[in-house]
Amino acid sequence: SEVEYIAEVGQNAYLPCSYTPAPPGNLVPVCWGKGACPVFDCSNVVLRTDNRDVNDRTSGRYWLKGDFHKGDVSLTIENVTLADSGVYCCRIQIPGIMNDEKHNVKLVVIKPAKVTPAPTLQRDLTSAFPRMLTTGEHGPAETQTPGSLPDVNLTQIFTLTNELRDSGATIR
């Protein structure tokens, strides 16, 4: 199943995806689309890159804020709405016959929590990484995005969850 990421309405969602350019600097085209990865290309493309830069974006809310030139093609969706919920496909179009890497990730957008006892930490958690993860084929990207907390592994998230629960914060 897809890795699941949760973001609150009005916040930024971060959907990780990366590859290792080989050799370094040898970039490959990538597309992000809404909907699971089809047979080739992406469905309902929201952003495309070529061998040099982003060359197609359907909205100004879609950004690659990581180090694109090092293979970090994680998607940031700014100011998310409930309509942004769904499965997204990150397709790394490695040259060759059927060589593509396909990564499906699920974004769940929720209405803001009514009670947030630890507002700063809660806000950062919402925008930086999922509050609920399931095991998937593609883990969090290694690079940080500006203004976000570092990516953490599942153990760290569960530890953080327990700490927040002890402090009275709500974790879904």
């Epitope: 992406c42 469905s43 197609d56």
Partner: antibody, heavy 120, light 107 residues
Framework: EVQLVESGGGLVQPGGSLRLSCAAS????????WSWVRRAPGKGLEWVSA????????YYADSVKGRFTISRDNSKNTLYLQMNSLRAEDTAVYYC?????????????WGQGTLVTVSS | EIVLTQSPATLSLSPGERATLSCRAS??????LAWYQQKPGQAPRLLIY???NRATGIPASFSGSGSGTDFTLTISRLEPEDFAVYYC?????????FGGGTKVEIK
């Protein structure tokens, strides 16, 4: 207006080769994935091959893998299909087809087709 | 590969009648299904994509529905120019496959 014009079809003997071309006009060629689809006499449609917008990634049906090669020249707005080791069962009308503007592997524009006949 | 079965193979109707065409997939394709119309000597024409979205320029009399394995193309009122062969196509799983077609003929 979108226009797709195929050429290069004809009669060829089994084991022979042909190169099909599809000249496109009326839109931005490079952004879309492209495919070749064929229709054999008295049969339905069969997807043959596809190529990504960049031209780097290619996809084939098992029936043609290793024999057919799809390519594109974005500077010429042209799609190609190099067909080698042709067999009688490759006899069909070959269509080039443009992938949807926002991705998706459906085809929103098709050429009129070019007939390939493989016979001795 | 995913097999698409279209039924009926032939549909005999009169102009003004409603046509209901079925396409069944051997396994789920989510909503990744398209419908095409083809007339003799012509290229296929996209009618519906993503199971229910009408393509540009397609009349409102054409509608698509379904998801998973069962899909339907409905022509609410047949016009003389609607008599043709209709194909469904899935793009949820490699390779892309088409159904065998349904011929809508004049009764």
């Amino acid at each position: 207006e979108v226009q797709l014009v195929e050429s290069g079809g004809g009669l060829v003997q089994p084991g022979g080769s042909l190169r099909l071309s599809c000249a496109a006009s009326g839109f931005t060629f490079r952004q879309n994935a492209w495919s070749w689809v064929r229709r054999a006499p008295g049969k339905g449609l069969e997807w043959v091959s596809a190529i990504s917008g960049s031209g780097g990634s290619t996809y084939y049906a098992d029936s043609v893998k290793g024999r057919f090669t799809i390519s594109r020249d974005n500077s010429k707005n042209t799609l190609y299909l190099q067909m080698n080791s042709l067999r009688a069962e490759d006899t069909a009308v070959y269509y080039c087809a443009k992938g949807g503007d926002y991705g998706g592997n459906y085809f929103d524009y098709w050429g009129q087709g070019t007939l390939v006949t493989v016979s001795s | 590969e995913i097999v698409l079965t279209q039924s009926p193979a032939t549909l005999s109707l009169s102009p003004g009648e409603r046509a209901t065409l079925s396409c069944r997939a051997s396994q789920s394709v989510s909503s990744y299904l398209a419908w095409y119309q083809q007339k003799p000597g012509q290229a296929p024409r996209l009618l519906i994509y993503d199971a229910s979205n009408r393509a540009t320029g397609i009349p409102a009399s054409f509608s698509g529905s379904g998801s998973g394995t069962d899909f339907t193309l409905t022509i609410s009122r047949l016009e003389p120019e609607d008599f043709a062969v209709y194909y469904c196509q899935q793009y949820g799983s490699s390779p892309l496959t088409f159904g065998g077609g349904t011929k809508v003929e004049i009764k």
